[in-house]
């Protein structure tokens, strides 16, 4: 190897980087010489330090390379016996800068090897929970909510292979919706939107809820706070807008603490919010009898 | 290899209804997101709506909700999308695609609505 | 929902020169340090193909003269040396939310 700039790229999946040593043409100057590793996307670098006896004023310098801008992640200082560096990507580079002679560069042997990227934990949705089969490439998450909470977004993420490997979509949410149509409702919960933050103003929200056939419904009011003002909950017993009511917030100061029944399969739950004032809103929970 | 087939073209009246299928083939049905997407003659995408066979999950887009019915059979590994009350604006290719970022296409199936 | 402009509509670009195309979102969908940005390329009787997926990953088996670049709300799609087959519709898409939306596609003719 010649003295002055020098540079080796290396690809295979591991490898070794050794400081040059063939410095037989004398020369005023010092080295400046660039090692290049790439190993295949989805996977990063992993450079493992097994010896190293620089001189004074000497540098080594490494950089994860790959992304939008280089990414440093060691230099001599950091470089003992042992150490351990991973770059986050599939490119890396080791830069060695010796000193002129007479005092002749120092010198190294260091060890990389390819490691598989994985994907980063998923966030685990508030009202909600997540599992993971694996967080490499193929893995996958699976999502789900609190009963009364409904997910927004996709249920089922997959790891990705790429450069940096990455779950196909953001994380979903848990949210309360204002309203819905909750079919062969056996049990569960409904909560009105923001619960249990405070609901927003100027809502109205209709649920129906309708039991299997041949069963009917059993309503409890798990909590029901409401601003005092024109803040109004009405149960209806049947499936629509104009069945008659069993509770009106309006009509009815004390919640009826052994809860509603309804006489067919269908309860409509109707919330209503005006533009001032707002409070926790409602948690009903609901389950099906035999008739 | 990954395998996306429709069904062929298909020529129907106003206000009946369709069901087109995408035959799967070559990777894990279950474990991977079928969509649907519309697009018009000569114009651009639109996303349906999408199914997880494994478990039945759907996901629609608030254009098409009562629109499409989206449905999915594991052991024949085959997708299906139901359209309803259909109208001359529902006439277009409707593609289905392979996972949440679409890395492959049927081959696309033309709906015609017409008296 | 997040909408997606493309430009140009169209382009014509000579025989081994570069084409370059404009997506833009209107609002950033980077998530996680991943942009939820992909590029399809769609030929006339033809289903889309992926080129692109997470602004700068080539989808496999798909030439190394098709590149993306971009994060936030500005991706950008390079072809080059544009060869003739390359003459396509091409569309951005993303995925970061629902409903994954589509650009209006950006029509690339071969002089």
């Known amino acids: 190897q010649t003295p002055g700039p020098c540079s080796w790229n290396f690809s295979g999946p591991e490898g070794s980087l050794d400081s040059p040593t063939d410095l037989s043409s004398p020369t005023d100057v010092g080295l400046d010489c660039f090692f290049y590793i790439s190993v295949y996307p989805g996977y990063g670098v992993e450079i493992k330090v097994q010896n190293i006896s620089l001189r004074e004023g000497e540098t080594v310098t490494v950089e994860g390379l790959g992304g939008p801008d280089p990414l440093p992640l060691a230099n001599q200082s950091f470089l003992l016996r042992g150490q351990v560096i991973r770059s986050p990507t599939h490119q890396a580079a080791l830069r060695f800068q010796s000193l002129p002679p007479p005092a002749g560069p120092g010198t190294f042997h260091f060890h990389y090897q390819a490691y598989l990227l994985s994907c980063h934990f998923p966030r685990r949705p508030a009202y909600g929970d997540v599992t993971v089969t694996s967080l490499h490439p193929g893995g996958s998450a699976r999502f789900h909510c609190a009963t009364g909470y409904q997910l927004k977004g996709a249920r089922h993420l997959t790891c990705l292979n790429a450069t940096q490997p990455f779950w196909d979509s953001k994380e979903p949410v848990c949210i309360a919706a204002c309203g819905g149509v909750i079919r062969n409702a056996t049990t569960g919960r409904i909560v009105s939107p923001g619960f249990p933050g405070n609901y927003s103003n100027n809502l109205t929200c209709h649920w129906l809820l309708e039991a299997p056939e041949g069963q009917r419904l059993h309503l409890h009011f798990e909590k029901v706070s409401l601003a005092e003002d024109d803040d109004r909950l009405i149960i209806r017993n049947g499936d629509n807008v104009e069945a008659p009511p069993v509770y009106d917030s309006y009509e009815v100061e004390y919640l009826p603490i052994e809860g509603l029944l309804s006489s067919g399969k269908h309860f409509f739950v109707e919330l209503s919010t005006d533009s001032s004032g707002a409070a926790a809103g409602m948690a009903l929970r609901y389950e099906a009898f035999q008739q | 290899q990954v395998q996306l087939q429709q069904s062929g073209p298909e020529l129907v009246k106003p206000g009946a209804s369709v069901k087109i299928s995408c035959k799967a083939s070559?990777?894990?049905?279950?474990?991977?997101?079928i969509n649907w997407v519309k697009q018009r003659p000569g114009q651009g995408l639109e996303w349906i709506g999408r199914i997880y066979p494994g478990e039945g999950d759907t996901n629609y887009s608030g254009n098409f909700e009562g629109k499409a019915t989206l449905t999915a059979d594991k052991s024949s590994t085959t997708a299906y999308m139901q359209l309803s009350s259909l109208t001359s604006v529902d006439s277009a290719v409707y593609f289905c695609?392979?996972?949440?970022?679409?890395?492959?296409w049927g081959q696309g199936t033309a709906l015609t609505v017409s008296s | 929902d997040i909408v997606l402009t493309q430009s140009p509509a169209s382009l014509a670009v000579s025989l081994g020169q570069r084409a370059t195309i404009f997506c833009r979102a209107s609002?950033?969908?980077?998530?996680?340090?991943?942009?939820?940005m992909h590029w399809f390329q769609q030929k006339p009787g033809q289903p889309p193909k992926l080129l692109i997926y997470a602004a700068s990953n080539v989808q496999s088996g798909i030439p190394a003269r098709f590149s993306g670049s971009g994060s936030g709300t500005d991706f950008t799609l390079n072809i080059h040396p544009v060869e003739e087959e390359d003459a396509a519709t091409f569309y951005c898409q993303q995925s970061i939310e629902d409903p994954p939306t589509f650009g209006g596609g950006t029509k690339l003719e071969i002089k």
């Open positions: 070559g990777y894990a049905f279950s474990s991977s997101w």
């Open positions: 609002q950033s969908v980077d998530y996680n340090g991943i942009s939820y």
């Open positions: 695609t392979r996972g949440l970022v679409m890395d492959y």
